[in-house]
């Protein structure tokens, strides 16, 4: 049967590990609701959506964000929530729809001609609002990357790793978000144990380069837990 | 529109590693799910593991955990296949496949809108 196919064929719906940290199960994520399956001629609806534990943004689809399903609820629990339409209130970038950003606690839209000059002041302004800003200003697909007309160099603002030049990644430095390099093998890396302590970082690094993963340097396996040095390693 | 390439493919021994990359053309690629699957002969096509848009989760079939690592760089257009400790048993076509990554929840193989060629892999005992 079509079910049968489906679950056999289905990503298991896995928790997310802590941190979020690639490598590890999870699920990968998915198209809307509507289905266009081969050799039919109409759309067919899986409902198959429930909420999503997350402990990032960039564990979510591109149309969501991660917070508390509830205000002022359990920060401990967050899941994956659909994203802000414009207008609506929103607290960081993320909150809102692609196509827009978050500007004095509204979702307002990604306007070409004046987001760029705007960047700065908005992620200014909004670290002032809520704490909650702290967890990330990215939104994945909010400004198409022809919005920049080239990639950011080290030290540019950004919003997202795609603004940034090959070699660079989008992360926080103080209330902003500059482009840094990417993590060569050898170097101190951030492996997040603590389900959202990635929020905390106000320095923060990027992921390690490809082919290499964040792991406990061999000679500090006999260290007390939070001595623990992880550096890139091969994998 | 997203065109998938798969590269990287080839004959080696039980034991070795092999990495596979699949390049694509389209500006959709960096919000897609990437994922990689397989085709023996004479068998259905199976999953191998998947990667979210931001290469924040990923997923693995339990044959493949411990021994093969997804990856994509999305400022490349690459996603990538790093396959150690290769069986006889992976022995298959692989070929990439994404689709829309919109919200968080189950995706099956059919919501993978688009697909590669493939590439062979055969791995001799």
């Known amino acids: 049967t079509l079910n049968s196919v489906l679950n056999s064929n289905a990503i298991k719906n896995l928790p997310p590990p802590l941190g979020g940290a690639a490598g590890h199960p999870g699920s990968a994520v998915s198209a809307a609701p509507g289905i266009l399956y081969p050799g039919g001629n109409k759309y067919q609806t899986i409902d198959n959506y429930q909420p999503y534990p997350c402990a990032e943004d960039e564990e979510c689809g591109t149309d969501e964000y991660c917070a508390s399903p509830t205000r002022g609820g359990d920060a401990g629990v967050q899941i994956c929530l659909a994203c802000r339409k414009r207008r609506k209130r929103c607290m960081r970038h993320a909150m809102c729809c692609p196509g827009n950003y978050c500007k004095n606690g509204i979702c307002v839209s990604s306007d070409q001609n004046h987001f760029r000059g705007e960047i700065e002041e908005t992620i200014t302004e909004s670290f002032g609002n809520d704490h909650s800003t702290l967890d990330g200003y990215s939104r994945r697909t909010t400004l198409s990357s022809k919005m920049y007309h080239t990639k950011g160099q080290e030290g540019s603002v950004c919003l997202r790793s795609s603004d940034c030049a090959s070699g660079l990644c989008c992360a926080r430095h103080f209330w902003s978000k500059i482009c840094k390099p990417v993590l060569k093998e050898g170097q101190v890396c951030t492996k997040h144990r603590r389900k959202g302590s990635h929020g905390l970082e106000i320095f923060q690094r990027c992921y390690c380069g490809e082919g290499l993963s964040c792991r406990i340097q061999k000679d500090h396996h006999q260290a007390s837990n939070s001595s623990r040095l992880h550096t890139c390693q091969r994998h | 529109e997203v065109q998938l390439v798969e590269s990287g493919g080839g004959l080696v021994q039980a034991g070795d590693s092999l990495r596979l990359s699949c390049t694509a053309s389209?500006?959709?690629?960096?919000?897609?799910?990437v994922g990689w699957f397989r085709q023996a002969p004479g068998k259905e096509r199976e999953f191998v593991t998947a990667i979210n848009w931001s290469g924040a989760r990923t997923d693995y079939a339990d044959s493949v955990k411990g021994r093969f690592t997804i990856s994509r760089d999305n400022a490349k257009n690459t996603a990538y296949l790093q396959m150690n400790s290769l069986k006889p048993e992976d022995t298959a076509v692989y070929y990439c496949a994404a689709g829309s990554d919109r919200y968080a929840r189950v995706l099956t193989e059919y919501e993978y809108v688009w697909w590669g060629q493939g590439t062979q892999v055969t791995v001799s005992s």
């Open positions: 389209g500006s959709a690629f960096s919000s897609s799910v």
